[in-house]
Amino acid sequence: QERRFQLEGPESLTVQEGLCVLVPCRLPTTLPASYYGYGYWFLEGADVPVATNDPDEEVQEETRGRFHLLWDPRRKNCSLSIRDARRRDNAAYFFRLKSKWMKYGYTSSKLSVRVMALTHRPNISIPGTLESGHPSNLTCSVPWVCEQGTPPIFSWMSAAPTSLGPRTTQSSVLTITPRPQDHSTNLTCQVTFPGAGVTMERTIQLNVSYAPQKVAISIFQGNSAAFKILQNTSSLPVLEGQALRLLCDADGNPPAHLSWFQGFPALNATPISNTGVLELPQVGSAEEGDFTCRAQHPLGSLQISLSLFVHWKPEGRAGGV
């Protein structure tokens, strides 16, 4: 008794779990003008529909609210919308049009729906650069999520000070006010699809711009071990004629520009070294006094000074008189 018709389009469709898919269906052109009724989508081998527009018909518990018949007889549309796809939706489906008046219905060919693992991951976007102490809005987005699906749950994880901003079906905004110590730490956006019970995440390393917070000088005297000074030092005794290597080191991101000056420089002073290393091959009277290392950075500068006090060799002094 049943009349058969062929579904147009592919024989199988693929969807990632948690996402949506539309199973296309058009009512047969052979349908008599007066034949009308209700539409039913069935899982192959089942007699309870997964979706229907018949108010007197129950649908399968497993698909209720996720599978919808998109019914528009004027446009001959009988498509099936599946949202929050689950692994167990992986099956063959067919459509049936049944009139309450007639003993025969119109049954479509089968179409297979393949549900694959979710491979899409969230995107994290950062507008411009992250600056220490300045709030920035980070957006975690899942543009591949369909609007009609169950809205995903967004979770953020970060050591930096944060607050949650607005969210949509497809995105969540996090306001972050990073500190210098948050540079190179991880920030994770985790997205859970409650309709399918799937979780995806993306982790990025924060690149925080910050001015130098610490500057230090390491001193190498001849072959002796280096020592480090972390604050301005009034006097460092050095033996006359000794080779001295001063190494300046500062934090900050991106790295600060290090330069050495003799004395206490004015802003536009000319450095005696344009790197963090100052070589003094033979300390003499010309080297007695102050040396300053300046760490220059777009977000701020820091400097540290060191005062050299030259000890004269006794024989050297006598020879000079």
């Epitope: 008794q1 007066s34 009308y36 108010p55 007889p73 004027r74 309450k100 007639m102």
Partner: antibody
Framework: EVQLVQSGGGVVQPGRSLTLSCAAF????????MHWVRQAPGKGLEWVAV????????YYADSVKGRFTISRDISKNTLYLQMNSLRTEDTAVYYC?????????WGQGTMVTVSS | SYVLTQPPLVSVSPGQTARITCSGE??????ASWYQQKPGQSPMLIIY???KRPSEIPERFSGSNSGSTVTLTISGTQPMDEADYYC??????????FGTGTKVTVL
């Protein structure tokens, strides 16, 4: 109580128009397909028109095609039959009926007399 | 157009069985419904989908569909069953179709 209450009948001259109404009570009107059926004096029942619950399907008996229009207003829970170019042979009691598996609920009927 | 033919009159004695036939084409593909109409009243559904009976309809009313003819049977007919009876079906091209109607008289 589930019921259909009809109004709008009367006497009308040939070629004129008339609109019948059928108000639904006690059930979810928007989920049911509705029909109009008529019965000429001393005659049998004659099916007239159908409108599906979603308004996606409308169909008419050949005798009224092009002259009668079936419609519904979900917000008012009301079914209508707009009858144009009326003829003397349209004289009948008109019934609205709800379709479940068949015509399970009927209105009380309203008389339409087409006479010059 | 599609026509459903019924006998105009069926007479039955009280307590006896009345059978009303309704002949038409392709009954094997269609569901039959039956309606009872008493004078001055709206029709009332008594049988749908060939054999099914609404809960408020007495069991003495039953329906059958042989594929060529559908039949309404009233077992143990009572005087209150005196009425006009109409079969009804849906046709692919005509739409809704009612039978010619049968008057049941209880003698």
């Amino acid at each position: 109580e589930v019921q259909l209450v009809q109004s709008g009948g009367g006497v009308v001259q040939p070629g004129r128009s008339l609109t019948l109404s059928c108000a639904a009570f006690g059930f979810t009107f928007s989920t049911y397909t509705m029909h109009w059926v008529r019965q000429a004096p001393g005659k049998g029942l004659e099916w007239v028109a159908v409108i599906s619950y979603d308004e996606g399907f409308k169909y008419y008996a050949d005798s009224v095609k092009g002259r009668f229009t079936i419609s519904r207003d979900i917000s008012k829970n009301t079914l209508y039959l707009q009858m144009n170019s009326l003829r003397t042979e349209d004289t009948a009691v008109y019934y609205c009926a709800r379709e479940a598996s068949a015509f399970d609920i009927w209105g009380q009927g309203t008389m339409v007399t087409v006479s010059s | 157009s599609y026509v459903l033919t019924q006998p105009p009159l069926v007479s039955v004695s009280p307590g006896q069985t009345a059978r009303i036939t309704c002949s038409g084409e392709n009954w094997g593909q269609k569901y039959a419904s039956w309606y009872q109409q008493k004078p001055g009243q709206s029709p009332m559904l008594i049988i749908y989908e060939d054999t099914k009976r609404p809960s408020e309809i007495p069991e003495r009313f039953s329906g059958s569909n042989s594929g060529s003819t559908v039949t309404l049977t009233i077992s143990g007919t009572q005087p209150m069953d005196e009425a006009d009876y109409y079969c009804q079906a849906w046709d692919d091209s005509t739409g809704g179709v009612f039978g010619t109607g049968t008057k049941v008289t209880v003698l």
